[in-house]
Amino acid sequence: TQNKALPENVKYGIVLDAGSSHTSLYIYKWPAEKENDTGVVHQVEECRVKGPGISKFVQKVNEIGIYLTDCMERAREVIPRSQHQETPVYLGATAGMRLLRMESEELADRVLDVVERSLSNYPFDFQGARIITGQEEGAYGWITINYLLGKFSQKTRWFSIVPYETNNQETFGALDLGGASTQVTFVPQNQTIESPDNALQFRLYGKDYNVYTHSFLCYGKDQALWQKLAKDIQVASNEILRDPCFHPGYKKVVNVSDLYKTPCTKRFEMTLPFQQFEIQGIGNYQQCHQSILELFNTSYCPYSQCAFNGIFLPPLQGDFGAFSAFYFVMKFLNLTSEKVSQEKVTEMMKKFCAQPWEEIKTSYAGVKEKYLSEYCFSGTYILSLLLQGYHFTADSWEHIHFIGKIQGSDAGWTLGYMLNLTNMIPAEQPLSTPLSHSTYV
């Protein structure tokens, strides 16, 4: 007689990443009996919600339910019905909602209440929606990549199971770029973290970690572009802005009201003699780079050393995983290879930005023009941020690994967030039961 397969004893969890530009739903799965083991949780699905970020629904909250439907229904299909009631659902909102809250706490609360109402009506164990702090976003991103890279495992291996693994227990730093903020998180080498706000202490799997983290609000790629436009239009002689960060021949009309809508441009706000202006691309990497550098105030530092805007940054240490928009942008530009030096990246960016807009549109016919038009800026911004903002050099560039997925799971804060909220990262090293790592029973 045939042996009947035992039912899979697995658990699921759902995390929604409500970012500034869009929302993504992630479904995670793990063996129920191995909850405390490192590296057992993996992503089984990612569903990108169609539409903008939740902060854009502030004037149309009644549309939030429909907006979330497709991905929540997908979760219903992927997760077995018998597991629905036990599957936790978490929603974390990031910098887009931080900015909305700065403008109006009442409006931010209304959006979150309606998001919660929509998510509560699914048969999962919904645990609530909240705006996570920049510090949490950095910390959870760091936990995610190191968990997936096996850095918390005490078992030394003679073989490498994941890319980038140098087979030591040195953790990777985490570089996260979103639309509205960017995070840098790493363990400095024997360096005191001079500002308490940037210091985190963790005990994970029996080991202590002193971690540095900072989230730069308004320095995500979308908000950085708004900042740059607001800064540059101040000195424009008329309603034409000749912009080196866009391809030659590119034209776009921008409403001044849209430019000043975000708190990120408040410092550049002024009364302009026009309601609209036209961006005209001139495609010059060097000038674009120079314009971006003006967003970073490096003249003031109350610590031994700073990133920019007076924010403490210890000397960089070890390898770094650069993910989210760092990865998406560099992947589009074909610059994620470990073999591409920083000098080569700069050369490629110079060539790319100089390409005429019509040529670019033809070469990338399948890409939405809104996104396509911004890769020159985004690529240049990434280089400026990493080199001048965080002080990477041509030599240390090789320590940056542009990562999309590790072991099939997206690099980002969501997995770390779920691991923390489901208590799946123990402070102490779990005791191995005799059978827990055996090949067969």
Partner: antibody, heavy 119, light 107 residues
């Protein structure tokens, strides 16, 4: 254990207003929403409105112009106020807890407060 | 507004029998339907949500089914304590609406 208890007048004159307080225990108003539902022999169960955990409200459009729901988290109380009452507002008024954080279905109901609108 | 119709005002059954209470929505509500039990002189008690998910503590003789516009609450092996009125409720869109109720009588 979870409990909700409505307290309010049993008789109100036509055109007057109604105020009911729902006092909750066993859960926090910062974690769950509270709905209001009424029941009458003529109209059955009617949903009136909800206050969600951060304080935003939604009302049944049929009652919106004369209804207000507020709360005091520290006192674990939700306040229901309806203006311009008429005879057909005679009903049992219930407060009910959202089953999940902010869901639109209810796992616990108060015992109800019976209201008669009459001169 | 979505109208929830419970066509049977009363249903008569015997202890040990199986009975099905039906509810029809005037438009598609997916599976956003809950069922409540109300005993005479008491407030409603939650039984089922999302059309077919039972609350913990609710006896497994209560089963919900259906999606779209047609929903059923089935009570198998009816007990005398099941004498009550049963209401369906849709929460697919505002305003939330309830069925007119079905009174279960024990023969």
């Amino acid at each position: 254990q979870v409990q909700l208890k409505e307290s309010g007048p049993s008789l109100v004159q036509p055109s007057q207003s109604l105020s009911i307080t729902c006092t909750v225990s066993g859960f926090s108003l910062t974690n769950y929403g509270v709905h209001w539902v009424r029941q009458s022999p003529g109209k059955g169960l009617e949903w009136l409105g909800v206050i969600l955990r951060r304080g935003s409200t939604d009302y049944n459009a049929a009652f919106m112009s004369r209804l207000s729901i507020t709360k005091d988290n520290s006192k674990s109380q939700v306040f229901f106020k309806m203006n311009s009452l008429q005879a057909d507002d005679t009903a049992i008024y219930y407060c009910a807890k959202t089953a999940v954080v902010a869901g639109d279905y209810f796992d616990y109901w108060g015992q109800g407060t019976t209201l008669t609108v009459s001169s | 507004d979505i109208v929830m119709t419970q066509s049977h005002k009363f249903m008569s059954t015997s202890v040990g029998d199986r009975v099905s209470v039906t509810c029809k929505a005037s438009q598609n509500v997916g599976t956003n339907v809950a069922w409540y039990q109300q005993k005479p002189g008491q407030s409603p008690k939650a039984l089922i949500y999302s059309a077919s998910y039972r609350y913990s503590g609710v006896p497994d003789r209560f089963t919900g089914s259906g999606s779209g516009t047609d929903f059923t609450l089935t009570i198998s092996n009816v007990q005398s304590e099941d004498l009550a009125e049963y209401f369906c409720q849709q929460y697919n869109s505002y305003p939330l609406t309830f069925g007119t109720g079905t009174k279960l009588e024990i023969k």
